[in-house]
């Protein structure tokens, strides 16, 4: 229904707290360099204005679109050009071009310092003093570093943060209560960020149809008892929600997501038997819970689908009559029978099926032609299954750190032109797949591994797009989203690469490394490993292991030495010489 005042409508639907949180996220995602105080001031102004519109929907400017209202606010910020450069040019445009322009200027890798967590005592003090401001800072800091973070989910993580602080700040040992719990939230939020960025990439690059196909596959796996009409309805609604969030329409997105959760809870009988626990929760927890609800029990007996999609003489007629509906049905029927496949694999299979029908339905004897499609699915299914087996075996043998190093070597060889920090970040993230997925039951491994890897590789592509340096990466990132992971997996050593000169300073370390937290130490060592591979791309695993073991031994010795500085300055050059010899 049309509302006289959009802003009043959203304020009423969402309530003041969520309204303010979402406006803060929106501003922080658009203008990533502004301070919290600058954004908080704008949020308060927008909220005060919304309240005037709630009181009188006919008041001045209350009929304006949210994009117009928010865009005008952003464009009124002083020193916009000095701080944001060409983003200020967006303000010369009219809506909807102005919003599109803001979206194009979102930076996936803003040059902001890492978000450091304060000491437990300091955190608890500022939380107790002003919980609202404290949580506002959290929303601001996360949103500006992750400009596509799924806004209603960020509100959920802020709520988790709030609950943890409320609980732990009342304990004697605040630190040991807070650290593991906040680490857990941080890990989940980072995964949520890359997954959502993947969805927005899908939407931006390939449009709503591509996202809806993803949603049909995912929902069919989770709700195998729901019929095709129900799955289609859910996929359509979910596509709208994600389109809004990816497009910066965060109030509409959160409101529509709440509506979708309400619909699902009111229609459990036709969707899934597993929703009740989620539906008993308050809004943010409910929507989060529904988004990761366990798969419903599959119907005891589902028939084979060959009769409808391979053996039927009328396949081409059915396909021609309504291509998207026929392919959607294929994807639905295949996905509900295969919760053990990744969404990416299911979409590749549907794509192969579509290509087969396009080819065969133009031939003299279509059934004879499309009758062979099942054999063509075999390599598509076996490739990711082998990937999972090989990589999980390697992870079990090496552990997370060793597995990350193996991936780092592999990816540095595939794309040595990529900057070392990007390679290290990618390898560390890709390596976490082992811990995240390889310990799961067999039938959950493939979807976990492949869909997680795809999301991480999407980030690699986004960073590479900014400064393209590797033809290998460009090739894999240019294709369709579902083909990326197989493309990266198939890459071999880049033969066009001219090895980097050996620079001793790259491998020179100082005693300050000894006091670094374990994670930072690992990053330093992994940076050195990537640089070694860039110097010797064809070094064997054995050679690299020798050098890295020597390096670890050197650090261990010097960090235990009474005079660390002397040890580093005398032993360091010897290490460099040994490294050069080992790789010669």
């Amino acid at each position: 229904e049309a509302h006289k005042s959009e802003i009043a409508h959203r304020y009423n639907d969402l309530g003041e707290q969520h309204f303010k949180g979402l406006v803060l996220i929106a501003f922080s995602q658009y203008l990533q360099k502004c301070s919290y105080d600058e954004h908080a001031k704008l949020v308060q102004e927008v909220t005060d204005f919304a309240k005037t519109c709630v009181a009188d929907e006919s008041a001045a400017n209350c009929d304006k679109s949210l994009h117009t209202l928010f865009g005008d606010k952003l464009c009124a910020i002083p020193n916009l050009r000095e701080n944001y450069g060409e983003l200020a040019d967006c303000c010369t445009k009219q809506e909807p071009e102005r919003n599109e322009c803001f979206l194009q200027h979102k930076d996936d890798n803003p040059s902001l310092p890492p978000f450091e967590r304060p000491e437990a005592e300091a955190m608890c003090t500022s939380f107790k003093e002003n919980p609202t401001t404290f949580m506002g800072h959290y929303l601001h800091e996360v949103a500006r570093r992750h400009p596509y973070f799924y806004a209603p989910e960020l509100l959920y993580y802020a709520e988790q943060y709030n609950e943890i602080l409320t609980q732990c700040c009342a304990e004697a040992d605040k630190e040991s209560c807070l650290t593991p719990k906040l680490d857990g939230v941080k890990e989940k939020a980072l995964v949520s960020s890359v997954r959502q960025r993947m969805k927005c990439s899908s939407m931006q690059k390939f449009g709503e149809r591509a996202f809806k196909a993803w949603a049909v596959a995912r929902l069919s796996q989770t709700f195998p008892n729901a019929d095709f009409a129900e799955i289609t309805k859910l996929a359509t609604d979910l596509t709208k929600v994600n389109k809004e969030c990816c497009h910066g329409d965060l109030l509409e997105c959160a409101d529509d997501r709440a509506e979708l959760a309400k619909y699902m809870c009111e229609n459990q009988a036709t969707i899934s038997s597993k929703l009740q626990t989620c539906c008993d929760k308050p809004l943010l927890k409910k929507a989060h819970c529904l988004s990761e609800v366990e798969h419903d029990t599959m119907p005891a007996d589902l028939p084979a689908i060959a009769a409808d999609f391979v053996e039927d003489q009328e396949v081409c007629k059915n396909y021609a009559e309504a291509k998207d509906v026929f392919l959607g049905t294929f994807l639905y029927e295949y996905s509900r029978r295969h919760p053990d496949y990744s969404v990416s694999l299911l979409l590749r299979l549907a794509k192969k099926y579509e290509a087969t029908l396009e080819k065969c339905c133009a031939e003299a004897n279509p059934p004879a032609c499309y009758g062979t499609v099942l054999a063509e699915f075999q390599p598509l299914v076996e490739e990711p299954k082998n990937l999972v087996k090989t990589n999980c075996d390697l992870y079990e043998k090496l552990g997370e750190y060793g597995f990350q190093n193996a991936i780092l070597v592999r990816y540095t060889q595939k794309a040595p032109q990529v900057s070392t920090p990007t390679l290290v970040e990618a390898a560390r993230n890709l390596g976490r797949v082992g811990t995240k997925c390889c310990t799961l039951p067999e039938d959950q491994r493939l979807p976990c591994v492949e869909d997680y890897l795809s999301a991480i590789l999407n980030r690699v592509c986004l960073l590479h797009e900014k400064t393209p340096v590797s033809e290998h990466v460009t090739k894999c990132c240019s294709g369709s989203l579902v083909e990326r992971r197989p493309c990266f997996s198939a890459l071999t050593v880049d033969e066009t690469y001219v090895p980097k000169e050996f620079k001793a300073e790259t491998f020179t370390f100082h005693s300050d490394i000894c006091t670094l937290p374990e994670k930072e130490k690992q990053i330093k060592k992994q940076t050195a490993l990537a640089e070694l591979v860039k110097h010797k791309p064809k070094a064997t695993a054995e050679q690299l292991k020798t050098v890295m073991d020597d390096f670890a031994q050197f650090l261990d010795t010097c960090c235990k030495a009474a005079d660390k500085d002397t040890c580093f300055s005398t032993e360091g050059p010897n290490l460099v010489t040994r490294c050069k010899d080992a790789l010669a």
């Epitope: 007996d301 589902l302 084979a304 060959a306 295969h338 099942l374 699915f377 075999q378």
Partner: nanobody
Framework: EVQLVESGGGVVQPGGSLRLSCAAS????????MGWFRRAPGKEREFVAA????????YYADSVKGRFTISRDNSKKTAYLQMNSLRPEDTALYYC?????????????????WGQGTLVTVSS
């Protein structure tokens, strides 16, 4: 983990019958689609028959339709293949397979567990 052991193979004259059994251990089979495949000397492995989890659906290769019958007894954790009107071209090593999830029933890549096989020879 599911371990599958086939039995019931042997030498039989053309037109004769055999009943193959596939006994599972390590897990119940009620959550698995069960299938039979065969490999004749010098040939690729081919699909023979499959049955859905609770036995409501059965599927057969064209070459065995009307002659072979697949069945299962979940309480005994066993699947069966009754083979009648056997022909020399049915000579092969017969494998039992179990797959947790299946869209096609006839594709070997949908089966997770395999037995070692039992030899059937049809000869006069």
């Amino acid at each position: 983990e599911v371990q599958l052991v086939e039995s019931g193979g042997g030498v039989v004259q053309p037109g004769g019958s055999l009943r193959l059994s596939c006994a599972a251990s390590g897990s119940t089979i009620s959550s698995y689609v069960m299938g039979w495949f065969r490999r004749a000397p010098g040939k690729e492995r081919e699909f023979v028959a499959a049955i859905s989890r609770s036995g409501g659906y059965t599927y057969y290769a064209d070459s065995v339709k009307g002659r072979f019958t697949i069945s299962r007894d979940n309480s005994k954790k066993t699947a069966y293949l009754q083979m009648n009107s056997l022909r020399p071209e049915d000579t092969a090593l017969y494998y039992c397979a179990a797959g947790r999830y299946s869209a096609w029933y006839s594709q070997s890549y949908e089966y997770d567990y395999w037995g070692q096989g039992t030899l059937v020879t049809v000869s006069s």
